[in-house]
C-alpha cells in the first residue's frame, strides 16, 4: 500500500508568492511559493495519485504583515481552502498568547491540529479541550493512518504560551500516544511536529512504532540529486534514521516559507512496516500557475494590508537616526530603539532567580536602512518601519560562548571607518573600543547585563560562559562576515518578523524618545 505525504513547515505568513530568497515578490515571472501556487500543485497531485495526505509541521504564524494584521485568521482561511489534513503546533503559533491561537485558528480550522507534548492545566484545560489533539486517525483510501503531533519544548522561551500550558519532553510524551494508536490497530504512524531536525532524528530513533517523521522548526532543506534552487541540502531526502529497534525510519522537512512542497512516497507492507520511501521537495516556481480563484481571494484580503501600512503605530518625539553615517560608525538611537524592542519582545519571566532569560542584543548597523524624521507630527507607520528594516528578516535567539561574542565585537571594528555594515549596535551590552590598537585586539572593555539577578547590572563578559543573545537572522547565518557566530553558535531558534517586533514595541510604548546613552564608547 502506497501513501503520498505532501508537507510544509515554517511557512511564516508567506501567503503571497515571494522572491527566490522568500522576501517580497518583485519580478512576478521569477517568484515562488504562495498559497495560490501551492493549491495548484496539491490539486494536481491529488487528482493523479490515490492516497494523499497534506500535512503542515507548524509555524504558519508570524513573518509578514499578513500575520500582523490578520493574526491567524488568514492561516485558518487559506489552510482550509487548501484542505490540509492535519497540522502540528509550532512555537510561533503561541506568539499572540493562547487566545491568539484558540480564536483565529483552533476554532476555525477544519482540520485537526496536533501536539502530544503540550498539556493544559488550570482554567485553560476545559477551555482548550478538544481544540487540539495529541493524535488523529485519518482514513486514507481503504486504510487508516495515525498522525501524532509534537511541539518544541523550548516554546515557553521562544513564544508566549502562558502559565497554563506545560511543554513536556517530546519523546516521553509521544511514546504513550503511539502505544495507544497501536492498541487501536493503527499500524501506520506519522510523527508530525515542530522541534527541529535533531529532535526529529531522535524521535525516529527512540519512539517505538513511529514509521515516518515529518518535521519543522530548523528550516532544514533535504534533497536527493541536484538541488533546484539556492538552498544547500543538509542531507538526502528522505533522511533515513535507524531506530533502536532496527527499523529504517524516513525523516523529512521542507525548508521554509512555502518555497517547496515536500513530496514523500512511502510503501507499506500489509503489517504497516515501511518497505520503501523516496521523494524530494518540489520547488514551487513560476512554471506552476497560481490558482486564479485563490489568487483573487488573496488580492481581496490584501486590501486591508495596504490600509494598515499607512496607519499610525505610535509617535516619536525625537529624530530616529538610522543614517549610515551614524549607525555604521557609532551608537545610534535607531539601533538602541531596535535593540530595546528586541529585548522587550523576548521578556519571559523564567523563574525567581532570573529577571529574564535574555538581556543582550546585537544588530549590524548595515541592517538599519533609513532614519525616521520626527517632524512629520512624530507619526510612525508600518511603511516607515519597512524603510528602516526592508529585508523581511527575523530577530532570533541564539546561545553563544563569551569568547564568540568577543570575536564578534572585534569583527565589528576590524576595518572601522569604511562605512561597512558590520559595526554592531547593541542592547544590554557596554563596549569600549580602542581604535589605535591593531584589528582583532580593539575591544578593551565588554560588559554585559546580568540575567540571574534581581537588579540588573553590568558585569564583565566571561569567555567560557554561555550567553543568550537576540540578533537578526542575517547575523545568525554568518552575514556581514560574522562567520564566527554561524560556526560557533550552540543553539539557534528563529524569532519574530523584524518589523513586527519594532512596531509592537512602538504601539506598546505609544510615545518613544530613544537616546544615545553610552552603550558604545571609544577610548
Amino acid at each position: 500500500w502506497e501513501l503520498t505525504i505532501l508537507h510544509t513547515n515554517d511557512v511564516h505568513s508567506r501567503l503571497e508568492q515571494t522572491s527566490e530568497d522568500s522576501s517580497k515578490c518583485v519580478n512576478a515571472s521569477r517568484c515562488m511559493g504562495g498559497v495560490a501556487r501551492l493549491f495548484t500543485k496539491v490539486q494536481q497531485i491529488r487528482r493523479a495519485e490515490p492516497n494523499v495526505l497534506l500535512l503542515d509541521a507548524g509555524d504558519q504564524y508570524q513573518g509578514t504583515i499578513w500575520f500582523t494584521v490578520y493574526k491567524g485568521a488568514e492561516v485558518a482561511h487559506f489552510m482550509n481552502a487548501l484542505r490540509y489534513d492535519a497540522m502540528a503546533l509550532g512555537n510561533h503559533e503561541f506568539d499572540n498568547g493562547v487566545e491568539g491561537l484558540i480564536e483565529p485558528l483552533l476554532k476555525e480550522a477544519k482540520f485537526p491540529i496536533l501536539s502530544a507534548n503540550i498539556k493544559a492545566k488550570g482554567p485553560l484545560a476545559s477551555q482548550i479541550s478538544g481544540l487540539y489533539l495529541p493524535y488523529k486517525v485519518l482514513p486514507v483510501g481503504d486504510e487508516v493512518v495515525g498522525i501524532v503531533g509534537y511541539t518544541s519544548k523550548e516554546t515557553p522561551f521562544l513564544s508566549n504560551p502562558g502559565t497554563n500550558l506545560v511543554f513536556e519532553d517530546e519523546i516521553t510524551a509521544l511514546q504513550p500516544e503511539v502505544d495507544k494508536l497501536k492498541t487501536l490497530n493503527v499500524n501506520k504512524i506519522i510523527a508530525l511536529g515542530h522541534s527541529g531536525f535533531e529532535t526529529d532524528k531522535l524521535i525516529a530513533q527512540k519512539v517505538r512504532g513511529v514509521d515516518v517523521v515529518v518535521g519543522g522548526h530548523s528550516n532544514t532543506f533535504l534533497y536527493t540529486g541536484n538541488p533546484p534552487s539556492k538552498e544547500v541540502p543538509a542531507g538526502k531526502y528522505p533522511f533515513i534514521v535507524t531506530s533502536d529497534d532496527g527499523r529504517k525510519v524516513p525523516v523529512v522537512q521542507a525548508y521554509a516559507f512555502g518555497k517547496y512542497l515536500g513530496y514523500l512516497k512511502i510503501e507499506f507492507d500489509e503489517r504497516g512496516n515501511v518497505i520503501s520511501s523516496h521523494g524530494n521537495p518540489i520547488l514551487l516556481n513560476s512554471s506552476i500557475p497560481e490558482d486564479p480563484s485563490i489568487k483573487a481571494d488573496i488580492n481581496k484580503w490584501r486590501i486591508k494590508l495596504d490600509n494598515y501600512s499607512t496607519q499610525e503605530l505610535g509617535k516619536t518625539i525625537v529624530y530616529l537616526d538610522g543614517s549610515s553615517q551614524s549607525c555604521r560608525f557609532r551608537e545610534c538611537n535607531m539601533g538602541n530603539l531596535i535593540c530595546d524592542a528586541m529585548i522587550n519582545n523576548n521578556l519571559r519571566h523564567a523563574d525567581e532567580m532570573f529577571w529574564n532569560h535574555v538581556s543582550m542584543c546585537i544588530l549590524n548597523g548595515g541592517g538599519i536602512r533609513s532614519p525616521i524624521d520626527e517632524r512629520n507630527n512624530g507619526t510612525i507607520t508600518w511603511e516607515n518601519l519597512a524603510a528602516v528594516l526592508p529585508f523581511g528578516g527575523t530577530f532570533d535567539l541564539v546561545q553563544l560562548k563569551g569568547s564568540t561574542l568577543k570575536k564578534a565585537f572585534e569583527h565589528s571594528v576590524h576595518r572601522y571607518g569604511q562605512s561597512t555594515g558590520e559595526f554592531l549596535q547593541v542592547g544590554g551590552i557596554h563596549v569600549v573600543y580602542d581604535l589605535s590598537r591593531k584589528p582583532g585586539d580593539r575591544v578593551v572593555k565588554l560588559d554585559v547585563l546580568c540575567t540571574k539577578c534581581r537588579v540588573p547590572s553590568y558585569d564583565p563578559l566571561k569567555m567560557d560562559e554561555i550567553y543568550k543573545v537576540i540578533l537578526p537572522n542575517f547575523l545568525a547565518n554568518g552575514g556581514d562576515g560574522f562567520q564566527m557566530i554561524k560556526d560557533e553558535l550552540l543553539r539557534h531558534d528563529s524569532g519574530d518578523q523584524d518589523i513586527n517586533v519594532v512596531s509592537t514595541y512602538i504601539s506598546k510604548m505609544k510615545v518613544i524618545y530613544p537616546a544615545v546613552e553610552g552603550r558604545i564608547k571609544f577610548s
Epitope: Q43, R46, R47, P50, A81, K265, H278, N280
Partner: antibody, heavy 117, light 113 residues
Framework: EVQLQQSGPELVKPGASVKISCKAS????????MNWVKQSHGKSLEWIGN????????NYNQKFKGKATLTVDKSSSTASMELRSLTSEDSAVYYC??????????WGQGTTLTVSS | DIVMTQSPSSLTVTAGEKVTMSCKSS????????????LTWYQQKPGQPPKVLIY???TRESGVPDRFTGSGSGTDFTLTISSVQAEDLAVYYC?????????FGGGTNLEIK
C-alpha cells in the same frame, strides 16, 4: 509547440506483448504526469494509469494492473507502455496524454493495436 | 471511484439548432477550496484524439468558439452548443478531473442531419 508523438500501429498475435512509445517535445517533460488512455472501437475512454516522469512512480487503474506497465526515459523525454498477454479484448486505440494542472492538456495521435491470429 | 453518466448517448440535430447534453457524477466535483467544479468536457472528432473544450465546468479553453458553454455544479453538468455547425460532428465526453482516479463518461455522439 507541445507535441506527443506516438509509435505506429501494431498487429500482434494473442498471448504476445507489445510496447507503445510516446515522445514528448515542447515542454519540460518532468513537469507533468503522463497518462495512458484506452479507447476500444466505438467505445468510451478508459484511463489505464499514469507515470510521474520525475521518479518513475506509477498509478494504475485496478482493471489494468498486470496488463499494462508504464515506464519513462527522461533522457529522451519518452514514455512507454507495455501490454502483455494480449487478447482480442486489448484491440483498441491507445493514447498518451499529459495531465497539466487542470486537465489532460495534450494528447498523442493514438496508436492502433490489433490483436489477431 | 467516481462514476460519470452522460445522456443522451446519441443526438441527431440540424445545423443551427441549439443542443444540450448532460453529465452526472456519482460524487460532487466541487472543490471547496477554490469553489471550482473539476469537470472537463472533451470533443473527439472522427479519427482524432480528444480535445479540451471546457474545464472547471464552465471555463472555455482558449480558441474554442463561444457557441460552446458549460454549466452546472456539484454533480449535475450540462454542455450547450448554441447553434450547431457541421464541424461540431463529434463525440463529447465529460471527465471527473477532481479526484483520483480520473473517470470519463460514456460519451454523447452528436450527428448532424
Amino acid at each position: 509547440e507541445v507535441q506527443l508523438q506516438q509509435s505506429g500501429p501494431e498487429l500482434v498475435k494473442p498471448g504476445a506483448s507489445v510496447k507503445i512509445s510516446c515522445k514528448a517535445s515542447g515542454y519540460t517533460f518532468t513537469d507533468y504526469y503522463m497518462n495512458w488512455v484506452k479507447q476500444s472501437h466505438g467505445k468510451s475512454l478508459e484511463w489505464i494509469g499514469n507515470i510521474n516522469p520525475n521518479n518513475g512512480d506509477t498509478n494504475y487503474n485496478q482493471k489494468f494492473k498486470g496488463k499494462a506497465t508504464l515506464t519513462v526515459d527522461k533522457s529522451s523525454s519518452t514514455a512507454s507502455m507495455e501490454l502483455r498477454s494480449l487478447t482480442s479484448e486489448d484491440s483498441a486505440v491507445y493514447y498518451c496524454a499529459n495531465s497539466g494542472y487542470y486537465y489532460f492538456d495534450y494528447w498523442g495521435q493514438g496508436t492502433t493495436l490489433t490483436v489477431s491470429s | 471511484d467516481i462514476v460519470m453518466t452522460q445522456s443522451p448517448s446519441s443526438l441527431t440535430v440540424t445545423a443551427g439548432e441549439k443542443v444540450t447534453m448532460s453529465c452526472k457524477s456519482s460524487q460532487s466535483l466541487l472543490n471547496s477550496g477554490n469553489q471550482k467544479n473539476y469537470l472537463t468536457w472533451y470533443q473527439q472528432k472522427p479519427g482524432q484524439p480528444p480535445k479540451v473544450l471546457i474545464y472547471w465546468a464552465s471555463t472555455r479553453e482558449s480558441g474554442v468558439p463561444d457557441r460552446f458553454t458549460g454549466s452546472g455544479s456539484g454533480t449535475d453538468f450540462t454542455l450547450t452548443i448554441s447553434s450547431v455547425q457541421a464541424e461540431d460532428l463529434a463525440v463529447y465526453y465529460c471527465q471527473n478531473d477532481y479526484s483520483y482516479p480520473p473517470t470519463f463518461g460514456g460519451g454523447t455522439n452528436l450527428e448532424i442531419k
